[in-house]
């Protein structure tokens, strides 16, 4: 069964850091581009970042550029999101999603930025 | 790089025959193996993607199977329009594709 499982969320103070992970199973992870999408409480979906299958090319939303870093370890079938200089407005459920058409999603992990 | 081999390189068959072509990858490509048909002077045509999924419009006499390193394209009852060259292609290492050397199917 194709699955994505996020972890690493939690409560962090403004200015702090967190590293999210997304463990993939049931498909050939190294084939697909992967993405992070977030959803603030009661709000819509916001694309955060993408990484190509090889890991060599990355894309970021303007709102996180310079603060967040997407990466992947194809040998471990895992996608990462390193989040630095966190702000209150980064509070959201963070989902990882597969491919250009976001055809498979994880269940999400909650990130709360608050003092 | 992933290398692809096919066997046989050519075969002769009659209309109505069951034809099997095999494709082997130098390392596991999971199920990310596609098959193409090419007729002389024409561009290749995608027949089967992801090992066993028939492209829309492709007759059901074509089928694919396998996983890992060993794959098979089967034509259950060869038709006159099926005489062509067939290529396998791995899309595991996308976007850097690798094709097999091809198998030519001609009339016995």
């Amino acid at each position: 069964e194709v699955q994505l499982l996020e972890s690493g969320g939690g409560l962090v103070q403004p200015g702090g850091s967190l590293r999210l992970s997304c463990a993939a199973s049931g498909f050939t992870f190294s084939l697909y581009s992967m993405n992070w999408v977030r959803q603030a409480p009661g709000k819509g979906l916001e694309w955060v970042s993408s990484i190509y299958s090889s890991g060599g090319s990355t894309l970021y939303a303007d709102s996180v550029k310079g603060r967040f870093t997407i990466s992947r370890d194809n040998s471990k079938n895992t996608l990462y999101l390193q989040m630095n200089s966190l702000r209150a407005e980064d509070t959201a459920v963070y989902y990882c999603a597969r491919g250009r058409a976001f055809d498979i999603w994880g269940q999400g992990t909650m990130v709360t930025v608050s003092s | 790089d992933i290398q692809m081999t096919q066997s046989p390189s050519s075969l002769s068959a009659s209309v109505g025959d069951r034809v099997t072509i095999t494709c082997r990858a130098s390392q596991s490509v999971g199920t990310y193996l596609n098959w193409y048909q090419q007729k002389p002077g024409k561009a290749p045509k995608l027949l089967i993607y992801a090992t066993s999924n028939l492209r829309s419009g492709v007759p059901s006499r074509f089928s694919g199977s396998g996983s890992g390193t060993d794959f098979t394209l089967t034509i259950s009852s060869l038709q006159p329009e099926d005489f062509a060259t067939y290529y396998c292609q791995q899309s595991y290492s996308i976007p850097r594709f690798t094709f097999g050397p091809g198998t030519k199917v001609d009339i016995k």
Epitope: S53, L59, A101 | A50, R55
Partner: antibody, heavy 118, light 108 residues
Amino acid sequence: EVQLLESGGGLVQPGGSLRLSCAASGFTFSDYDMHWVRQAPGKGLEWVSGISPSGGWTWYADSVKGRFTISRDNSKNTLYLQMNSLRAEDTAVYYCARDWYSSGLDYWGQGTLVTVSS
Amino acid sequence: QYELTQPPSVSVAPGQTARIICGGNDIGSKGVHWYHQKAGQAPVLLVYDNTDRPSGIPERFSGSNSGNTAALTITRVEAGDEADYFCQVWDSTGEHAVFGGGTKLTVL
């Protein structure tokens, strides 16, 4: 109807240059990775180069790296292949093809012949 | 940056047809993907590249796209279709994914 139409092929001397074009229609060109695949006379298929939807990412076969440049103009729905320092072994029919969401090259052009000879 | 506009809510009776629209400048030249998200769950892809359905998605869900409006049509609406619906495109100028604001579908 999805269509891909290559142009720009011809006869060129070794060391020379050519620019191939591929005009796309019938689909959302800017949503797809696009590729060039070539076929030498009487030989099999060889992947040459690929490009991401925005053109930000490009990939090349080792045999053409440093000599060929792939690009695209999404406003014109056109894919390009700039070929420099051409060699006899680059002689082939060059096809452009669309990558269908990582599941094979589902549409191909009719090809354009490039002949490198003195 | 490219913007997509969706109505905040749509209401429909069971068995009827719901049409959820997504507006964007010349959206007809782009490929639109549609998702639904039920309360407390992750989004699910319903339609990709304007009109194509992933395996497992019922034919009741269909997409269209032309001019400045894309639409998701749900026929024979069921109570279980109640969810938030999001459209999405890739902004080819900057290679950014863009989502619409979402439409809450209420089944009366």
